[in-house]
């Protein structure tokens, strides 16, 4: 299997909530002794390899935002702990998997990563990441919703319709 | 605070049994995939015993498979190694430690001793 | 079973000299190795992950390097708590194994 990341780039201004997306693709094993552990954490562009380094994304860990299940099963983190910091990463029957951040800063902007590990039993685990930039942007020059660049294109897109601003 | 503390080690003659537990605090137990990983007087450190956050997959190390079960209880935080048929080669310090997949072991406890000895 | 070997056994050094510790793996582990330091009557603690990145709260002293079947860990300018055991794991392959340790003197 494969981890594809519909959109590379995340431009966002202050403010806004933005949900960025892993999907999974290629055969996935519904089998019982097959399951998926899938998480979230910041990282850096390394010289030797991408979302190498696990940082914590507004001081969760990987190991608070992870998601633990079968196949294409749907879960949805420990959400008190998430949600106190405005975050909330959940996955869905279809592959997708994503982490949902509230009410932006500038402290956001950066590489974020996720990580998929199949554990099949009596075998190694196989792991895959993909990565996704996130800019936070204030002031004059800042967009009035995320915009988002598609990985294959240079095409962007506005999802305003899919993400409001955070209500106090 | 987030730790791991065993107990349950001691002398043992050989062809004995022994149960150890490990209890976890500070970190959500049920959430983490647990290992045991035993270190002889002097020697350097060896996997034995892992156990998935729901309590399967289980795996052994060939030296203790079929001698020694691992096992939680994630309503009571806690890990254990059921140990039987001990022999002299056991006795080492068995430290409960933490893990998840694709990662390692990131906490560790104090240990506790078991020697296996007439 | 993938066999690490850790060399050298032992290295003598004096505080502030730069400490250089090998493992090599039997068969490719990719990335997936791991260093501890365990100092006398102490748990091992975890240093470095995934070959070359440092555990939450590790000095900048302490760099590593390698994939494959090839690792160093590196120790720039040793300070007085940096004499220990050192050991490598690796995760690529069950049974998850350990390097026989590199004890870290004071020369």
């Known amino acids: 299997f494969k981890v594809a990341t519909p959109y590379s780039l995340y431009v966002c201004p202050e403010g806004q909530n933005v949900t960025l997306t892993c999907r999974l693709l290629g055969p996935v094993d519904k089998g019982h002794d097959v399951t998926f552990y899938k998480t979230w954490y910041r990282s850096s562009r390394g010289e030797v390899q991408t979302c190498s380094e696990r940082r914590p994304i507004r001081n969760l860990t990987f190991q608070d935002l992870h998601l633990h299940h079968g196949g294409h099963q749907a879960a949805n983190t420990s959400h008190d702990l998430a949600q106190r910091h405005g975050l909330e990463s959940a996955s869905d029957h279809h592959g997708n998997f994503s982490i949902t951040m509230r009410n932006l800063t500038l402290l956001d902007s950066g590489l974020y990563c996720c990580l998929v590990v199949e554990i099949r039993h009596h075998h190694s685990e196989h792991r895959v990441h993909g990565a996704m930039e996130l800019q936070v942007q204030t002031g004059k020059d800042a967009p009035s919703n995320c915009v988002v660049y598609p990985s294959s294109s240079q095409e962007s897109e506005n999802i305003t319709a899919h993400h409001h601003h955070h209500h106090h | 605070q987030v730790q791991l503390v065993e107990s349950g080690g001691g002398l043992v003659k050989p062809g004995g049994s022994l149960r150890l537990s490990c209890a976890a605090s500070?970190?959500?137990?049920?959430?983490?995939?647990m290992s045991w990983i035993r270190q002889a007087p002097g020697k350097g450190l060896e996997w034995v015993s892992y156990?998935?956050?729901?309590?399967?997959?289980?795996y052994y190390a060939d030296s203790v498979k079929g001698r020694f079960t691992i096992s939680r209880d994630n309503a009571k935080n806690s890990l254990y190694l059921q140990m039987n048929s001990l022999r002299a080669e056991d006795t080492a310090v068995y430290y409960c430690a933490r893990d998840l997949p694709g990662w390692y072991f990131d906490l560790w406890g104090r240990g506790t001793l078991v020697t296996v000895s007439s | 079973e993938i066999v690490l070997t850790q060399s050298p056994a032992t290295l003598s050094l004096s505080p502030g000299e730069r400490a250089t510790l090998s493992c090599r793996a039997s068969q490719s582990v990719s990335s997936y190795l791991a260093w501890y330091q365990q100092k006398p009557g102490q748990a091992p603690r975890l240093l470095i992950y995934d070959a070359s990145n440092r555990a939450t709260g590790i000095p900048a002293r302490f760099s590593a390097s390698g994939s494959g079947t090839d690792f160093t860990l590196t120790i720039s300018s040793l300070e007085p708590e940096d004499f220990a055991v050192y050991y490598c794991q690796q995760r690529n392959n069950w049974p998850r194994t350990f390097g026989q340790g590199t004890k870290v003197e004071i020369k």
């Open positions: 156990i998935s956050n729901s309590g399967s997959p289980i």
């Open positions: 500070g970190f959500t137990f049920s959430d983490y995939y």
